[in-house]
């Protein structure tokens, strides 16, 4: 059974991940972002189901495409370089989902824009956090 300290750690990691994803979304949606129309041509795959921490595997698999889109902005809308930002997210995701479990991600048929993709994972984080508090 999870201890209160491990639950607290999970909650903090999820909150950190949530803030990172929200920061990216805000940077993309910034009215000064001249690359938005091009960014919105990038296609992302969404999980068929995302209700447990193991489903973060689906996010992990889409981090490389996410970095490529963020590279378009050339850090103008972000405090960190895309590589560093994605690296930070990757570390959190690996810790949260656990590396010992091998979960095969199932994706929905429909593709999503970067905005839809980020909103989906933001909702995921908020949902899991609410079950922990």
């Amino acid at each position: 059974a999870p201890t209160s300290s491990s639950t607290k750690k999970t909650q903090l990691q999820l909150e950190h991940l949530l803030l990172d994803l929200q920061m990216i979304l805000n940077g993309i949606n910034n009215y000064k972002n001249p690359k938005l129309t091009r960014m919105l041509t990038f296609k992302f795959y969404m999980p068929k189901k995302a209700t447990e921490l193991k489903h973060l595997q689906c996010l992990e698999e889409e981090l490389k495409p996410l970095e490529e889109v963020l590279n378009l902005a050339q850090s103008k809308n972000f405090h960190l370089r895309p590589r560093d930002l994605i690296s930070n997210i990757n570390v959190i995701v690996l810790e949260l989902k656990g590396s010992e479990t091998t979960f095969m991600c199932e994706y929905a048929d429909e593709t999503a824009t970067i905005v839809e993709f980020l909103n989906r994972w933001i909702t995921f984080c908020q949902s899991i956090i609410s079950t922990l508090t």
Epitope: P34, R38, M39, T41, K43, P65, E68, V69, Q74, E110
Partner: antibody, heavy 121, light 107 residues
Framework: EVQLVQSGAEVKKPGASVKVSCKAS????????IQWVKQAPGQGLEWMGA????????RYIQNFKGRVTMTRDTSTSTVYMELSSLRSEDTAVYYC??????????????WGQGTLVTVSS | DIQMTQSPSSLSASVGDRVTITCITS??????MNWYQQKPGKAPKLLIY???TLRPGVPSRFSSSGSGTDFTFTISSLQPEDIATYYC?????????FGGGTKLEIK
């Protein structure tokens, strides 16, 4: 080897429609945007629009909106560009070309051989 | 739409010459500039893409520089097989736009 093979030359009357095909091979068809470029005789290059074969999403330039339709058939890895209400200034070579990298919009790396469309009464 | 001003529209040079083509954009496009070579009756060929990156297999005599609004394409030592029309393309935002082209001829 990546290849884009286009349909043959067409001669059309003003007001008619033309449908140019572009058959892709040598890569994962559904994960690269296919873009279309027009080149009128002796003129430069003009970007027309694009389609993402994975979901059929399209982008069209304002000049062609309403007259151009891009579609795809994933079973045959073929993209189509249909231009309606043809006029003499539509006489051109039309190229399909693949985006340099997957998922998003980049410059075009591989190109079809071009299809000459002649509009003449 | 982003406007592209490519110059010169034509130029004549001798084998071994250094050749320079410029492209100026109406807005800042970072380094999202690409350069194509087109020979008569053929499809354009991508030589250099975003970030002044030379495509694999393209001879090193071709290079480019610039970011923001001012871009330069250079052939360090013109070869007979370089006779073609060259185009710049901005891939910063939609719709993509091409420069008017530069027709290169041998003196």
């Amino acid at each position: 080897e990546v290849q884009l093979v286009q349909s043959g030359a067409e001669v059309k009357k003003p007001g008619a429609s033309v449908k140019v095909s572009c058959k892709a091979s040598g890569y994962t068809f559904t994960t690269y945007w296919i873009q279309w470029v027009k080149q009128a005789p002796g003129q430069g290059l003009e970007w027309m629009g694009a389609i993402y074969p994975g979901d059929g999403d399209t982008r069209y330039i304002q000049n062609f909106k309403g007259r151009v339709t891009m579609t795809r058939d994933t079973s045959t890895s073929t993209v189509y560009m249909e231009l309606s209400s043809l006029r003499s200034e539509d006489t051109a070579v039309y190229y399909c070309a693949r985006s340099l990298a997957t998922r998003g919009f980049y410059a075009m790396d591989y190109w079809g051989q071009g299809t000459l469309v002649t509009v003449s009464s | 739409d982003i406007q592209m001003t490519q110059s010169p529209s034509s130029l004549s040079a001798s084998v071994g010459d250094r050749v320079t083509i410029t492209c100026i954009t109406s807005t800042d496009i970072d380094d999202d500039m690409n350069w194509y070579q087109q020979k008569p009756g053929k499809a354009p060929k991508l030589l250099i893409y975003e970030g002044n990156t030379l495509r694999p297999g393209v001879p090193s005599r071709f290079s480019s520089s610039g970011s923001g609004t001012d871009f330069t394409f250079t052939i360090s030592s013109l070869q007979p097989e370089d006779i073609a029309t060259y185009y710049c393309l901005q891939s910063d935002n939609l719709p993509y736009t091409f420069g008017g082209g530069t027709k290169l001829e041998i003196k």
